[in-house]
Interface confidence: medium
């Protein structure tokens, strides 16, 4: 079989070399497809103009053919969620090639030098795809091409430069640095497959954001807000790993992207939904759980291709593990009255009691301030399916249980010195489920007992009416 | 520099079980799948098996599948290679190789254990 | 399971000549692996992907071949490299070596 290394390999005029040099250049992208889920099994190495190993390694021409890209890398070998991906793409996708991009002398280099050579190593694999189209029966349109962190871009200039245009683009979580605010042409955009999704794990407002920040797909899945992911923190990592540093944590929230989309694979009974949102403040507020009008998604693999003359910028929570999916609620609470509120926020808590299971304790999240005369809209969310909602009980955090509202509870009655209870008036709560989309009223049990105060807890059950349904399409109807 | 350290020789009863272990240095554990292949006196090589440190998966050789387990502790970087049922024909040196995944070939040895199975 | 035949067994050579290793597989494999064991020691990789010098390696060595037949050259022996050489594949499970060739001083 031919040499592994073959002419797609070759450094380019891009690196600016002298010509002279550039022969003597030991060849730096390899195409591996992987012929087993194993990573022991050493696959076969495909070369642009060299039929055989296609032939000798039973590459399908008709099925779908995915290329794994990888990123900048500080080890310079492959990392363990490569191996993963591998191995669920192979199990989901039995009969489909599966090729990784080996650039690793590329990416092995100053970050900086490495966001150089994105350029070439995305023409290697426009190049490889240009001579696999020559080939009877491989289509474009079956290519699905999966880069992390600087391998999305690499993806990106790949579906720039091939002729025609690659079915799909995966970017988990592209990188930021270099690459925020750059030209679309010098980054992954929309542009460069006929369907583009992106998951962003690691994004910051403040400090350095290894991802990128900016919309650059069709869609752009922001899971947990793009930034803090759940079991990434130092404690979990200090937990987990015997060395847990800052390093751990980065290493973590920048590498859930794949894990995501590893989940999606492989847990395809458990999907988790995006929902359409403008920011990630009014997703927190609980404002934007609609699946109308394309507004909700799957993540990953299953995701519904979705060609928006805009980006669409998309959220849910997650767990901290596999599988990640968790179930989204929406609650709007009318507060008709309340007295005697001082400057302090109340703490809110419900729980959810459903005809599977029973929820935990759950915070309500107040993102800006409790409105009177006004609903105001939560999200809460549930690791477990708790099947339909029955009743819902409403806690008022008494002051003592948090030195923080202690202190302002002091204060204010410093200043007030004759303050009375304060009270809150809530008659009823309306839920809406993200992942079922339905929408249910729950009452006070007492209707003559609507207030609540700290310390206290209000019960409340489903109303007469019952469920109302919206005509409202339902996000799991819709799976495979 | 990358070392593999193994545990010292070993001498066993027919039908006892033996446990070598293989401590690793200077490179992130986790990342490197890790094989065992042994050595019968005056013989050639043989592969008995693998285990990835990251997430404990194991691949065995199916002529020792029923007698050999491989496990790891990553707390230590240690991966152990435990044969039960142990025969005079499993006398040989013991061997833990690092393979890089997706590289493709055995690039640093332990340098081996002796188990000598005599009655 | 894929079974390696090396051939010759032994090789008896003076330093300076040309060895030639040979490695013929029972089905086809997409590479082959080279190793170099001395007496008490652990194995060292010389070749990979068929035709890859390892690192550290001198270039005196180099691998060729494909399918079933596979071959190791030592352009001109040194003293160093009077040692036993193992093919190995890893193209299926288990992944199996080759019986061995001596190559000793004539």
């Known amino acids: 079989s031919p040499v592994p290394f073959g002419p797609e390999g070759r450094l380019e005029d891009k690196l600016h070399k002298p010509k002279a040099t550039q022969t003597e250049v030991k060849p730096s992208v390899r195409f591996n497809l992987r012929t087993s889920k194993d990573p022991e099994h050493e696959g076969c190495y495909l070369s642009v103009g060299h039929s055989q190993p296609l032939e000798d390694c039973s590459f399908n021409m008709t099925a779908k053919t995915f290329f794994i890209i990888h990123g900048w890398t500080m080890s310079g070998i492959f990392e363990n969620w490569l191996h993963k991906l591998v191995s669920a793409l192979h199990t989901r996708e039995k009969d489909a090639n599966v090729v990784v991009v080996d650039w690793l002398p590329l990416a092995h280099q100053l970050y900086t030098d490495a966001v150089n050579n994105t350029r070439v190593v995305g023409h290697s694999i426009a190049r490889m795809l240009d001579w696999l189209q020559e080939k009877d029966d491989f289509s474009l349109g079956n290519v699905h091409l999966i880069g992390y962190s600087l391998g999305a871009h690499v993806a990106g200039y790949a579906g720039n430069f091939v002729k025609g245009t690659v079915g799909r683009i995966t970017g988990l979580d592209p990188a930021g640095p270099m690459f925020e605010g750059a030209d679309i042409h010098k980054r992954l955009s929309p542009d460069d497959a006929d369907f583009v999704d992106v998951l962003h794990t690691y994004t910051r407002s403040f400090g350095l954001s290894i991802g990128i920040q900016m919309p650059v797909g069709h869609i752009d899945i922001y899971p947990n807000g793009g930034d803090f992911q759940p079991g990434c923190g130092l404690n979990d990592v200090l937990g987990s790993i015997a060395y847990g540093t800052i390093t751990e944590v980065v290493k973590c929230e920048h590498e859930r992207a794949v894990h995501l989309f590893v989940d999606s694979l492989v847990n395809q009974d458990k999907p988790s939904f995006a929902f359409q949102c403008t920011d990630s403040n009014r997703f927190k507020k609980g404002i934007c759980l609609s699946c109308r009008k394309n507004r909700c998604n799957s993540i990953g693999y299953n995701a519904k291709k979705m060609r928006n003359k805009r980006n669409s910028k998309m959220y849910l929570k997650t767990r901290a593990g596999m599988p990640f999916r968790v179930y989204h609620y929406q609650m709007k609470i009318h507060v008709f009255s309340y007295k005697n509120m001082g400057e302090i926020e109340p703490t809110f808590y419900v729980t959810l009691y459903g005809t599977n299971a029973d929820s935990q304790t759950l915070p309500l999240e107040i993102v800006e301030r409790i409105e009177q005369n006004a609903t105001n809209t939560f999200l809460v969310y549930t690791e477990e399916d708790l099947g339909d909602l029955l009743k819902i009980q409403l806690t008022w955090e008494g002051a003592s249980q948090s030195w923080y509202n202690l202190w302002k509870e002091f204060r204010s009655y410093l200043s007030q010195p004759r303050n009375p209870g304060r009270e809150l008036n809530i008659r009823r709560i309306r839920v809406k489920s993200g992942e079922t989309q339905r929408k249910l009223t729950f009452c006070t049990e007492d209707p003559e007992n609507t207030s609540i105060s700290p310390g206290r807890e209000l019960w409340f059950r489903k109303c007469r009416d019952g469920w109302r349904m919206k005509n409202e399409t339902s996000p799991t109807v819709e799976l495979p | 520099q990358v070392q593999l350290v193994q545990s010292g020789a070993e001498v066993k009863k027919p039908g006892a079980s033996v446990k070598v272990s293989c401590k690793a240095s200077g490179y992130t554990f986790t990342e490197y799948t890790m094989h065992w292949v042994r050595q019968a006196p005056g013989q050639g090589l043989e592969w008995m098996g693998s285990i990835n440190p990251y997430y404990g998966g194991t691949s065995y050789n199916e002529k020792f599948k029923d007698r050999v387990t491989m496990t790891r502790d990553t707390s230590t970087s240690t991966v152990y290679m435990e044969l039960s049922s142990l025969r005079s024909e499993d006398t040989a040196v013991y061997y833990c190789?690092?393979?890089?995944?997706?590289?493709?070939?055995?690039?640093?040895w332990g340098q081996g254990t002796t188990v000598t199975v005599s009655s | 399971e894929i079974v390696l035949t090396q051939s010759p067994a032994t090789l008896s050579l003076s330093p300076g000549e040309r060895a030639t290793l040979s490695c013929r597989a029972s089905?086809?494999?997409?590479?082959m692996y080279w190793y170099q064991q001395k007496p008490g020691q652990a194995p060292r990789l010389l070749i990979y992907?068929?035709?890859n010098l390892a690192p550290g390696i001198p270039a005196r060595f180099s691998g060729s071949g494909s399918g079933t037949d596979f071959t190791l050259t030592i352009s001109s022996l040194e003293p160093e490299d009077f040692a036993v050489y193992y093919c190995q594949q890893f193209t299926s499970s288990p992944y199996t070596f080759g019986g061995g060739t001596k190559v000793e001083i004539k």
């Open positions: 190789a690092r393979y890089g995944n997706y590289v493709g070939y055995f690039d640093y």
């Open positions: 992907y068929t035709s």
């Open positions: 089905s086809s494999v997409h590479y």
